[in-house]
């Protein structure tokens, strides 16, 4: 006899990285028969939603109107059908950004390189942080973590055309409080025709996304988006 229901799916809209004072909605998708959803924050009950007939809702939304560092952290949700509770969802790391300062991102030897060349990104921030994050725009969410007193190195090694794209970095004051994003650095990797044609294209965000780095998510893209979030969040853990 089944003692628990399958775990729900949790994600943030429009994004798990939320600029300070902006709004975010945490979504929890469970089962149409659910009579209660609970959102937990850092292990404690944070909010409850109870669909009632004639609602037939398999997804509930918990709205945070004004993001701040107190709201940043790990969220999970569970739901109940009758008396039976689900397994908890995966953890959602909600990050507050635009805290304090803006780092500077540079690339060596330069933004235009040849396939096979060794490339290193440098993220610099002169305030009290020792952890840095390098993000490549795109749903596959290449995120790297680096450490240093005021600067972190991110060696990409010998690059291929798959490394092409736009990069930004953040200073991280803790796992869930990040700086403003750096200005973007676009890496252009040239290679021979064969390499280029075989290079996997990285699906990227819309061009204006990183102004507030919010991903517009239509219903059909929610799972893709959450997958993007999940990949990025693996690094946070």
């Amino acid at each position: 006899q089944q003692q628990t229901l399958p775990k729900p799916f949790i994600w943030a809209e429009p994004h798990f990285m939320v600029p300070k004072e902006k709004q975010v909605t945490i979504c929890c998708q469970g089962n149409y028969g659910a009579v209660e959803y609970q959102l937990h924050f850092e292990g404690s009950l944070f909010a409850v939603d109870r669909p009632k007939p004639p609602e037939r809702i398999n997804k509930v939304q918990f709205y945070i109107p004004d993001m701040n560092s107190r709201m940043a952290g790990q969220y999970s949700c569970i739901y109940r059908v009758g008396e039976l509770w689900s397994e908890p969802s995966n953890l959602l790391d909600l990050v507050v950004t635009e805290m304090y300062d803006t780092p500077t991102l540079s690339v060596h030897p330069g933004p235009e390189v040849i396939s096979g060349e060794k490339v290193t990104f440098y993220c610099r921030l002169d305030t009290a942080t020792s952890m840095f994050l390098l993000l490549k725009e795109g749903r596959s969410s290449h995120v790297q973590r680096g450490y240093g007193k005021v600067q972190a190195e991110f060696p990409l090694g010998p690059v291929t055309t798959a490394h092409r794209g736009t990069y930004r970095c953040f200073g991280s004051y803790n796992n869930h409080a990040w700086s403003f994003p750096s200005e973007p650095v676009k890496l252009l990797v040239t290679g021979d025709i064969e390499n280029t044609s075989l290079a996997p294209e990285d699906p990227t965000f819309p061009a204006d996304t990183w102004g507030t780095y919010l991903l517009t998510t239509e219903t059909g893209l929610q799972k893709d988006h959450a997958l993007w979030d999940h990949t990025a969040q693996n690094l946070l853990r």
């Epitope: 007939p53 004639p54 037939r56």
Partner: antibody
Framework: DVQLQESGPGLVKTSQSLSLTCSVT?????????WNWIRQFPGNKLEWVGY???????NYNPSLKNRISITRDTSKNQFFLKLNSVTTEDTATYYC??????????WGQGTSVTVSS | DIKMTQSPSSMYASLGERVTITCKAS??????LSWFQQKPGKSPKTLIY???RLVDGVPSRFSGSGSGQDYSLTISSLEFEDLGIYYC?????????FGGGTKLEIK
Amino acid sequence: DVQLQESGPGLVKTSQSLSLTCSVTGYSITSDDYWNWIRQFPGNKLEWVGYISYDGSNNYNPSLKNRISITRDTSKNQFFLKLNSVTTEDTATYYCARLGYPAMDSWGQGTSVTVSS
Amino acid sequence: DIKMTQSPSSMYASLGERVTITCKASQDINSYLSWFQQKPGKSPKTLIYRANRLVDGVPSRFSGSGSGQDYSLTISSLEFEDLGIYYCLQYDEFPWTFGGGTKLEIK
């Protein structure tokens, strides 16, 4: 597209039973949602009568509870309203309606029932 | 039973005007409130559920707000097709109960 159609007698005598059928096409009544009867009195006041849910469970308006029954025939994809011991106060347009938010609801066009003595 | 009191019972408004209809419950209904529109000669249709959530396919000029006992439906810019009767419905407790309706006519 879900369509609902009410049918039944337009005229019922006082103290008799009123029986209405709602035929549903384009969606199985066992799949999901709440299958309601709602009536609208002359003067436009709306009253929720009751529902049978996708799983066969019922909820009725207590003001009608001892004389109401909502049942279904899943093989015909129909659900039914039976109201016993009717009075002239049961004169109304009766709607069957599928409700299941956030989906757009679906209603029948309504059937007018007059109770006469 | 929970009594739902709607106001006004009827109103005239001009095209393009912002229109607000209110509904007051006899007790706290915890935002379990929906709004219906009934066009002349037609069946009702739900616009909003859970006080402020738009039903799929409803134009964004409709919005709902409120909590506790007091709720409102707003049409941001009235269109001709919006004329009809508007009802609120509480579904916090059985029996579900409707408001008396607001007849909206074009000035």
